[in-house]
Every structure is written in structure tokens, then in C-alpha cells.
């Protein structure tokens, strides 16, 4: 649906004129001139940069820019006492230390205050002991070594690899094993891609670079002394001992060339099978210890950070709706940034300001939106999504009440291959019906759209024809939009290609090597990729803000409720007999997914023939689009976890990054042939079934007619 | 792969002075430590001398405290070594080393990348 009919129309002022508004060579401009120093959670530097976007917001037309701050705990390493992991004899003497930095990049060095590496939120502490290799450290590496190899973590300190899931759960599942100590290393099978060089004459990860990182399991927490409120002046904290998340052992992070050091000592046991072998060239020995000659020799580690409760600064811009004030869509990405950012975040921000300065533009020129936008700028996302969430936490009535939508804008790129977007199902067609007519950047598709590219390189698995659109899971800010507040959100940026590239993530994420020159030599030099990411996080606030009946299509939710619940059906079903003897059944979570279905449909149909010149109606129409989301949030949240409350996704328990569906019933399954006592157990899968049953028949409900 | 490439060495007598330069290939090494080290015939290999990725902090074994200078250029990708006062006892051959690492002092394991050698010969 076109926004042509937008308030103050003239034909200029329609999304084609905001779109046609956005340029590259903008986009290069703010990226370059935000990644020339660190910005670092908590710093003056980031305060500055705070300022300086807060200024430049004013400049570009919004109505009002104010930063909120608030007081949370962050976490630094010792200036004068530097953390480092030493290999020592018998003697106690260290006879191997990992460096205490990354060498810096060329033209970098004499950049001060750039944060060595390691792991936010580690507690001080010098353990010393014998290695076990963990291999990902995943649920399923630890099931491995504890229950077929026998191997005993506990009181040994464990090395595990970057990737595959959030470095936190690989903390959580070495704590829950015993360890007293983990190492994370970012290993060349997962950070060196083959064929291209290492920074600065390629994008891969040298041997000395190190992904930094917090390893906490918030649970969506935010501030872990104030959960569930706003860490403000008059704010009550607990202590240290109470504070969400925090891990209990000592973490520290080290690149692959430290790492071989440690590993090429390695006895023990074997790997159990190839996938545990990296590509150093090692024999990825799982241990316990060292092999006969080095026997004597143990791991130390010595970690002296400091956790502190330190000032953040979010910067808030708000453009004014002409028609329905009380509706706020967000655009909203962090500015936080380990060392220099140069993807991550500013990849993101640098394409937010070209946003605002577009649409400041359009208002400029006498154009508002039907809709109010917000524009975020948070901080303190790298300590744990801290910013994004204090402020939902001090506005959270609002938002429950107001919020249409959110958006994200953290990195824009993580690869050149095709476009990425996770969101909720009441986007899917939003996205599609936007990219459709969006031009690819892509080489091979000239005067293609961006939709053909993105389906052709990134095919649905269960739709042919159309493009994948993944579950949105954690990791970012949209956490506490959709995972709490049951508002409606989106992610969008240009990936790498997945199938021939199956490092995590980008290879110098979160190093002191993500560079602006990283960006400009080797993944965008023309920035069109960026720019087309702004023309889709930009049209997707365009049409959530302006559009007269708002852009969700709920029959695709119903779509989704069936997958899902087939899928969770059969997970269910690999234990038949225990169905059968505890007498769970998925008929009332079925029937509530057909009557979702039946409902949704019904309401697509009145959506379609409503008299949309009625004020009255058009709101109320609105209204239920916008309180679907919120329709699937359970105020009493997940087992665990208060702060996850929707009930049809959540934050993987294995994985933060990963999103899950029905993960209430989902974890109630889980490893469910190890509980101790089964008939508790399927107790709580048959309560789960019930709950999540419950929340998509009383969703359905509020889609039908209202009297 | 990275290469250093070591140059300079040569044949001087006691007492004078030899400057001898490594160039690395690849400027993916250019800020890391470096270091040259040195092996004469029938002995270990051994550092005598490494500095910072900026030239801050330099490291010299007790041998050639106060005669050798090590000094870089990271934007020539170059490393240096100023032998002055050259005794009988420097002849080696020697070799350069780079560490992607902030550690300066270190065996020949400890370093990452390493040159083929130049031969310095002080004759008495």
C-alpha cells in the first residue's frame, strides 16, 4: 500500500522522496567520522559522540533531541594491573605469558585509550590448574565430554572456541560444569576465511586479534543492580552479590596465535570426532593437562577487572506525528562501541544519521509524518543491551500503550553477499512488498530488485519464490521491545554468504582491527550496500509511520503458529510412550492455532472493505493490528526468566543470539530423557502446552469483532 | 605469507659499526613486536634484541646492552639493528622475528614470523 496519502501531501512527499534523499557518499561521511577514536560505554569519548549526534539531530530538523542517562554497572579492566594467562612449571615460574594487546592497526598507533581485550563482567580472580578443550563450550560439547568421554570439568579451567552460540551460555555451561576458569579463543576455522588475507590487507582475523565481549546471562535484565527499573538517580541497587547475570568465574579472551601455545601442549583424551578440530595445527587434545613432557605444567590465569556503576547517555530525537501523535514508531541502534567500531555499531549509526537527515529534509520542506518517530541512539549496548533497556524500563507504560513498532539499526553490514532480516511475522509482507521495490546493489542483478537478489541467494526453506526471513532472538536492542514489551519489531543488514563462509560472524568482530578502513577497502567501498540497508530500515519506518492502515498482515502469524507447532508436535512425539503414559496432548494448542487462523483470516477480510475515512473504525482497526503483538506477552514471563515474556519466541537457553519458538514448552522438553523425575517433568511440558495454547486463543480474541 | 627479509650484513672489523635492516612483506606485521635474534655456530638461537609496536619499549639481552640500537618504521615496514663497538663474539648469523604479541622478550618459538638470516662476521 502506498503512503501517498500522508498528511500534508504533495506528490514529492511520499516515500519515494525520502528514499531518493538517502545518500552513499553521506552514509561514508558519518561512518568515517565516528569510528576515528574509540567510544567505549562509560567514556567521555562516547559522551562526546553523544553530544555531537544530539547536535547534529537538532540541526537536521527533529522536534526535540534530549539525552537520558542513567547510572549502571560496567565493567573495565585494570589500567596499572593488566590481565593475562600464563603457562608455569612446576616451580611456579611463568614460562609463556598471552599479550596483554592486540598490535595495533597501521595509522592507529598512537590512539589512546583503545580497551584491551576482555570479557565485561569477569570476576577478579587467579585460578590456576589443568586445561580441558571444550570445543564451543555449547550444551551439547559439554553433554559430550561429561557423558560419553567421562571427563570431569570440575576444578579444571576450560578453553573454548568463539562461535556458534553467545560467548555468555559458553560461560554458563562451564560454570554449570565446574570449571574455574574459562578461556575463549577465536579459532582460524571460525575467523580466517580461506583464500583472503589478514587485516590490514584483507578482512581476516590475525593471530594477535581478539574478540572482546560481556559474558552475562541477563536474561533481559539490563542493568544487572536494577532489574526491572530504570537505573536512575533514586534508584535502589543491589549488591554485587544479588546482581542479575554475573558470571562467577574468571573469563578472559585471547587470538589464535596465544592460543596455540596452550593447545599445542594438550593430552589427554582425543578429540571425539573431526568437528572438534579447528584448523590450527594442533591435535585439539581434550585433556585434562598437558601431554607427558610439559605434565607438570599448569594454566594461571590472572583477571583484575572491576566492575563499576558508571553514567550512560542515550540520545532520544523525536518527529512529531501530525495525526496520531500517540503512535510511536522507532528507529533505534547503539553507539557504544569496543574500540573503533567500524561495523559494529557504526556501520548502523552512520546510516540512522542519513535516516534523520532524510527525513529531517521532508519535515523541513513542511512534510510530518501521520505517525510520531523515535530516533535512539543507546549506549552501553556491548555491556548488555543497558541503554536500550533502562529506557524502555522508565518508558515502559508508554510503550505498552503507544509503541507500533521498533526497528533496529545495529551494523549494517556483516558480510556483501545478500540481505538478512529478522522480525516478527506481522512484517513478513511489509518486507517483501518494500524490497520489491528496492533496486539491488548486488552484481548480476542490475535493474533487479533487491527482492529477486535476496531470493535468489537467500531462498526461503518452506516458501519457493520467496526470500528467507529468520526469528528474531537476541543479542541486540530490539530485546526489550519485542521480548518483553510485546512490541512488533525488525532487522535488517547485508550478509555474507553462509553457505561457502562458515566462520562466525565477520572475522575481526569486536577487534581492535573493525576499522573505518576495514569497511571502505574490503566489504563496501562504494557504500551501496549500506545504503541500500538504509533504504530498507528507512522504508520500513516510512510505511510503519505513515501508512493510513498500518503494515501488518496477521494471517501470517497464523502461518508460523501451525509451523511452529508442528514443529514442537514432533519434538514431542520422539518420546511416544511417555505422551502416551503421562497423557499429553497438543489438541487444545492445534485447535487454538486453527481458531488463530480462522479469526486472522476473518479480520484480513474486514481489514480490506472497512471505511477507512472513519476515524473512529480506522483507529480501532489500527489498534488491534498493533496490540497483536502484545497480545502474545504472558506477564508472568518464562520459567526463569521474567523479563522473556513472549510466548511464541524467545532467546534460545542454549544460545542468547538464537531465536526459539514456544520456547516455554520447548525447554520443558529439553534433555527431558535425563530429568530425575519424569512425571514432573511431563507435568511441566503438558503446563506449557496449556500456557502457550491459552496465550494464541486469547490472541485470536483480539482480532475478532469487537461487539 | 608473510616474509622478512633481512639485509646489511657483511664482514667489519673489531670495534666498528654494522647496521643491518629487515623488511616485512606484508603489512599485516607491521605494528607487531620485532625483534632480532641471533644463533652463532654451535650455540642456541637467542634474542638480542626486540621493541615495541611503537618503538616505545625496547629489550636488549646483557651482551649488547649500550652498543646495539633496534629501532622501526611502520609505515616502511622496516626494522633495524645499529651494531657499534662489534666484538668477535657477535659473529652470528642473525635473524629477524616478528610476535603478534605485546611480549618483547621471548624464545624462537615465542615469535611468529621469522627471516632466513643474515651472516654478521667481526673479524680481530
Known amino acids: 500500500k502506498s503512503s501517498n496519502e500522508a498528511t500534508n501531501i504533495t506528490p514529492k512527499h511520499n516515500m519515494k522522496a525520502f528514499l531518493d534523499e538517502l545518500k552513499a557518499e553521506n552514509i561514508k561521511k558519518f561512518l568515517y567520522n565516528f569510528t576515528q577514536i574509540p567510544h567505549l560505554a562509560g567514556t567521555e569519548q562516547n559522551f562526546q559522540l553523544a553530544k555531537q549526534i544530539q547536535s547534529q539531530w537538532k540541526e537536521f530538523g527533529l522536534d526535540s533531541v534530549e539525552l537520558a542517562h542513567y547510572d549502571v554497572l560496567l565493567s573495565y579492566p585494570n589500567k596499572t594491573h593488566p590481565n593475562y594467562i600464563s603457562i608455569i612449571n612446576e616451580d611456579g615460574n611463568e614460562i609463556f605469558n598471552t599479550s596483554l594487546f592486540e598490535p595495533p592497526p597501521p595509522g592507529y598507533e598512537n590512539v589512546s585509550d583503545i580497551v584491551p581485550p576482555f570479557s565485561a563482567f569477569s570476576p577478579q580472580g587467579m585460578p590456576e590448574g589443568d586445561l580441558v578443550y571444550v570445543n564451543y563450550a555449547r550444551t551439547e560439547d559439554f553433554f559430550k565430554l561429561e557423558r560419553d568421554m567421562k571427563i570431569n570439568c570440575s576444578g579444571k579451567i576450560v578453553i573454548a572456541r568463539y562461535g556458534k552460540v553467545f560467548r555468555g551460555n559458553k560461560v554458563k555451561n562451564a560454570q554449570l560444569a565446574g570449571a574455574k576458569g574459562v578461556i575463549l579463543y577465536s579459532d582460524p576455522a571460525d575467523y580466517f576465511a580461506p583464500g583472503v588475507k589478514s587485516y590490514p590487507d584483507g578482512w581476516n582475523l590475525p593471530g594477535g586479534g581478539v574478540q572482546r565481549g560481556n559474558i552475562l546471562n541477563l536474561n533481559g535484565a539490563g542493568d544487572p543492580l536494577t532489574p526491572g527499573y530504570p537505573a536512575n538517580e533514586y534508584a535502589y541497587r543491589r549488591g554485587i552479590a544479588e546482581a542479575v547475570g554475573l558470571p562467577s568465574i574468571p573469563v578472559h579472551p585471547i587470538g589464535y596465535y596465544d592460543a596455540q601455545k596452550l593447545l599445542e601442549k594438550m593430552g589427554g583424551s582425543a578429540p571425539p570426532d573431526s568437528s572438534w578440530r579447528g584448523s590450527l595445527k594442533v591435535p585439539y587434545n581434550v585433556g585434562p593437562g598437558f601431554t607427558g613432557n610439559f605434565s607438570t605444567q599448569k594454566v594461571k590465569m590472572h583477571i583484575h577487572s572491576t566492575n563499576e556503576v558508571t553514567r550512560i547517555y542515550n540520545v532520544i530525537g523525536t518527529l512529531r506525528g501530525a495525526v496520531e501523535p500517540d503512535r510511536y514508531v522507532i528507529l533505534g541502534g547503539h553507539r557504544d562501541s569496543w574500540v573503533f567500531g567500524g561495523i559494529d555499531p557504526q556501520s548502523g549509526a552512520a546510516v540512522v544519521h542519513e535516516i534523520v537527515r532524510s527525513f529531517g529534509t521532508l519535515k523541513k520542506e513542511g512534510w510530518r509524518p501521520r505517525r510520531t518517530i523515535l530516533f535512539a541512539s543507546w549506549d552501553a549496548e556491548e555491556f548488555g543491551l543497558l541503554g536500550s533497556t533502562e529506557w524502555a524500563e522508565e518508558n515502559s507504560r508508554l510503550l505498552q500503550e503507544r509503541g507500533v513498532a521498533y526497528i533496529n539499526a545495529d551494523s549494517s553490514i556483516e558480510g556483501n553477499y545478500t540481505l538478512r532480516v529478522d522480525c516478527t511475522p506481522l512484517m513478513y509482507s511489509l518486507v517483501h512488498n518494500l524490497t520489491k521495490e528496492l533496486k539491488s546493489p548486488d552484481e548480476g542483478f542490475e535493474g533487479k530488485s533487491l527482492y529477486e537478489s535476496w531470493t535468489k541467494k537467500s531462498p526461503s526453506p518452506e516458501f519457493s519464490g520467496m526470500p528467507r526471513i529468520s526469528k528474531l532472538g537476541s543479542g541486540n536492542d530490539f530485546e526489550v521491545f519485542f521480548q518483553r514489551l510485546g512490541i512488533a519489531s525488525g532487522r535488517a543488514r547485508y550478509t555474507k554468504n553462509w553457505e561457502t563462509n562458515k566462520f562466525s560472524g565477520y572475522p575481526l568482530y569486536h577487534s581492535v582491527y573493525e576499522t573505518y578502513e576495514l569497511v571502505e577497502k574490503f566489504y563496501d567501498p562504494m557504500f551501496k550496500y549500506h545504503l541500500t540497508v538504509a533504504q530498507v530500515r528507512g522504508g520500513m519506518v516510512f510505511e510503519l509511520a505513515n501508512s493510513i492502515v498500518l503494515p501488518f498482515d496477521c494471517r501470517d502469524y497464523a502461518v508460523v503458529l501451525r509451523k511452529y507447532a508442528d514443529k514442537i508436535y514432533s519434538i514431542s512425539m520422539k518420546h511416544p510412550q511417555e505422551m502416551k503414559t503421562y497423557s499429553v496432548s497438543f489438541d487444545s494448542l492445534f485447535s487454538a492455532v486453527k481458531n488463530f487462523t480462522e479469526i486472522a483470516s476473518k479480520f484480513s477480510e474486514r481489514l480490506q472493505d472497512f471505511d477507512k475515512s472513519n476515524p473512529i473504525v480506522l483507529r480501532m482497526m489500527n489498534d488491534q493490528l498493533m496490540f497483536l503483538e502484545r497480545a502474545f506477552i504472558d506477564p508472568l514471563g518464562l520459567p526463569d526468566r521474567p523479563f522473556y515474556r513472549h510466548v511464541i519466541y524467545a532467546p534460545s537457553s542454549h544460545n542468547k543470539y538464537a531465536g526459539e519458538s514456544f520456547p516455554g514448552i520447548y525447554d520443558a522438553l529439553f534433555d527431558i530423557e535425563s530429568k530425575v523425575d519424569p512425571s514432573k517433568a511431563w507435568g511441566e511440558v503438558k503446563r506449557q502446552i496449556y500456557v502457550a495454547a491459552f496465550t494464541v486463543q486469547a490472541a485470536a480474541e483480539t482480532l475478532s469483532e469487537v461487539a | 605469507e608473510v616474509q622478512l627479509v633481512e639485509s646489511g650484513g657483511g664482514l667489519v672489523q673489531a670495534g666498528g659499526s654494522l647496521r643491518i635492516s629487515c623488511t616485512a612483506s606484508?603489512?599485516?606485521?607491521?605494528?607487531?613486536?620485532k625483534g632480532w635474534f641471533r644463533q652463532a655456530p654451535g650455540k642456541e638461537r637467542h634474542l638480542v634484541a626486540a621493541?615495541?609496536?611503537?618503538?616505545?619499549?625496547?629489550y636488549y639481552s646483557d651482551s649488547v646492552k649500550g652498543r646495539f640500537t633496534i629501532s622501526r618504521d611502520n609505515v616502511k615496514n622496516t626494522v633495524n639493528l645499529q651494531m657499534n663497538s662489534l666484538k668477535p663474539e657477535d659473529t652470528a648469523v642473525y635473524f629477524c622475528?616478528?610476535?603478534?604479541?605485546?611480549?618483547?622478550?621471548?624464545?624462537?618459538?615465542?615469535?611468529?614470523?621469522w627471516g632466513q638470516g643474515t651472516q654478521v662476521t667481526v673479524s680481530s
Open positions: 622475528a616478528a610476535r603478534g604479541s605485546s611480549w618483547l622478550y621471548g624464545t624462537w618459538d615465542d615469535y611468529h614470523y
Open positions: 606484508e603489512r599485516s606485521v607491521s605494528t607487531y613486536t
Open positions: 621493541i615495541s609496536y611503537n618503538g616505545d619499549t625496547t
